[in-house]
């Protein structure tokens, strides 16, 4: 690593990449952009997928947290030979398909999509792309778009969650490197710590959840703190306050000493969750403490 900023969030990250004919001479820049970004998402709970689209969508690498598989996926990505039309909706559909399968059996992991394209979408193709991006959103995904060169920012703002979820790169493909920091900052939702991390058994507490990106939700009213108790029961609580770098949440009352609550955050009212390694434990507190 080069010591640059990193993201510790545990979620599912999908790269949807334009490999149409117009990017033929710029694939190296796209690849390098993805490679740099991929190495900055470092949570062991983060899974990644690479999807490319031209006249159809292809899943080059299905979701995996295995760093060796991700390395191999990046090698596959580097070998891509661009060509064909800009059927962006085909890429979104491949992402939605994965999100559906992965979240169909109980625990639902939050999904973040970073879609990159270089051209304006003709009317029908824009309609299809917006429709498929909406389907990904219906399945709980947060959608970001990176537009390079001849993109239409208004279109991308409708495909992405909002205009704040669009990263315009007006200076051509070589300028992609320049947005890595900002895209990382905006797309990263991470839980870093809880204060206090030890609470008294049987008592009510408030917990400050430290992290980043909590206001990246489309609607901050839908942010929830979630406590997975002893790896079984999950309790969701509405935070008292939502700021970008912290949440103030009521902690569940944990009756017994030694109980553990793993901290998660939902950005969409419990549809899916960002996981973390942050644990709250209970201890015995005497009356005087």
């Amino acid at each position: 690593e080069d010591g640059g900023p990193a993201c510790y969030g545990g979620f599912d990250l999908y790269f949807i990449l334009d490999k149409s004919g117009s990017v033929l001479h710029h694939w190296n820049e796209i690849y390098y952009f993805v490679e740099q970004l991929a190495h900055r998402f470092i949570s062991p709970q983060l899974r990644m997928s690479f999807i490319v689209f031209s006249t159809r969508g292809t899943t080059l690498m299905k979701l995996t947290e295995d760093r060796e598989q991700i390395r191999q996926g990046l090698e596959e990505l580097q070998k891509v030979l661009p060509g064909g039309d800009t059927y962006m909706h085909e890429g979104f559909e491949r992402a939605s398909e994965q999100i559906y399968y992965e979240n169909s059996q109980g625990y639902r992991t939050a999904s973040v999509i970073i879609a990159l394209t270089d051209g304006e979408l003709h009317e029908d193709l824009f309609f299809y792309s917006e429709r498929e991006a909406n389907r990904s959103r219906d399945l709980g995904a947060i959608v970001y778009c990176v537009g390079v060169k001849d993109f239409n920012e208004t279109q991308l703002a409708r495909i992405a969650d909002s205009k704040d979820h669009v990263f315009p790169v007006n200076d051509g493909f070589q300028a992609l490197q320049g947005i890595i920091h900002s895209i990382l900052k905006k797309s990263c939702i991470e839980i870093l710590a809880a204060e206090p991390s030890t609470i008294c058994a049987g008592e009510s507490f408030q917990v400050v959840v430290r992290g980043n990106g909590f206001r990246h939700a489309r609607n901050v009213d839908r942010v929830l703190c979630s406590f997975k108790i002893n790896d079984s029961v999950t309790l969701n609580e509405k935070p008292f306050a939502v700021e970008d770098t912290y949440l103030l949440c009521p902690a569940p009352i944990l009756k017994e000493v030694g109980m553990k609550a793993a901290l998660q955050v939902s950005m969409n009212d419990g549809l899916s969750f960002i996981s973390s390694s942050v644990i709250i434990t209970t201890t015995h507190c005497s009356d005087g403490s």
Epitope: R56, G57, T58, T59, L60, K62, E90, E93, S96, E97, Q98, Y100, Y101, E102, S104, R131, N134, R135, D138, L139
Partner: antibody, heavy 121, light 107 residues
């Protein structure tokens, strides 16, 4: 428990229109996460997907290329059912026709009982 | 679009492991689903998304997908598993099915 009940004639004359209906119980045709589709099965062609409809704030459909010019799938929200119409049929369209639920729109997790449709004069 | 090829038939002794293959160019890039169909009945989904089992399907059914082959594995095959099995995949607004494999449980 979700069930799909198919109805429609078992015999259709060549050049006429094949019409089948699939009544849904225990779910809604307008469910935002699902699609509803038709598949047919014949000895010569195996299983063949024909098309699907789904609701995402408005109705959409997708049809298989092989039948695109002849097929219509429509929802009937008042009766909670959907229908298949296949125009200009030939003996090649003789098959068992199934309706199916498609959660997420990507697979068929529940099938109707099937209707054998014979195209013959 | 992807074409899916299955062996027409597979035989297995009761209690043994049956493996049914489904080959297609780079099928690992797609998700494979498997349907079981008994005579006179509609197909039933037994595996979806390469390896996921719907509720109600016995644990002896499992799936995998790598390279150019998806595989349905039935461990400890029982007489009631005798049926036709179809693989399927979703590709660019099209649903593709394999030709089907007749599984015979011997004895």
């Amino acid at each position: 428990q979700v069930q799909l009940q198919q109805s429609g004639p078992g015999l259709v004359k060549p050049s006429q229109t094949l019409s089948l209906t699939c009544a849904i119980s225990g779910d809604s045709v307008s469910t935002n996460g699902a699609a509803w589709g038709w598949i047919r099965q014949s000895p010569g062609r195996g299983l063949e997907w024909l098309g699907r409809i789904y609701y995402r704030s408005k109705w959409y459909n997708d049809y298989a290329v092989s039948v695109k010019s002849r097929i219509t799938i429509n929802p009937d929200t008042s009766k909670n059912q959907f229908s298949l119409q296949l125009n200009s049929v030939t003996p090649e369209d003789t098959a068992v026709y199934y309706c199916a639920r498609m959660p997420g729109g990507f697979l068929f997790d529940l099938w109707g009982q099937g209707t054998l449709v014979t195209v013959s004069s | 679009d992807i074409e899916l090829t299955q062996p027409p038939s597979v035989s297995v002794a009761p209690g043994q492991t049956a493996r049914i293959s489904c080959s297609g160019d780079n099928i690992r890039s797609y998700y494979a689903h498997w349907y079981q169909q008994k005579p006179g009945q509609a197909p039933v989904l037994v595996i979806y998304g390469d390896s996921k089992r719907p509720s109600g399907i016995p644990e002896r059914f499992s799936g995998s997908n790598s390279g150019n082959t998806a595989t349905l594995t039935i461990s400890g095959t029982q007489a009631e598993d005798e049926a036709d099995y179809y693989c399927s995949s979703y590709a660019s607004h099209d649903y593709v099915f394999g030709g089907g494999t007749k599984l015979t449980v011997l004895g």
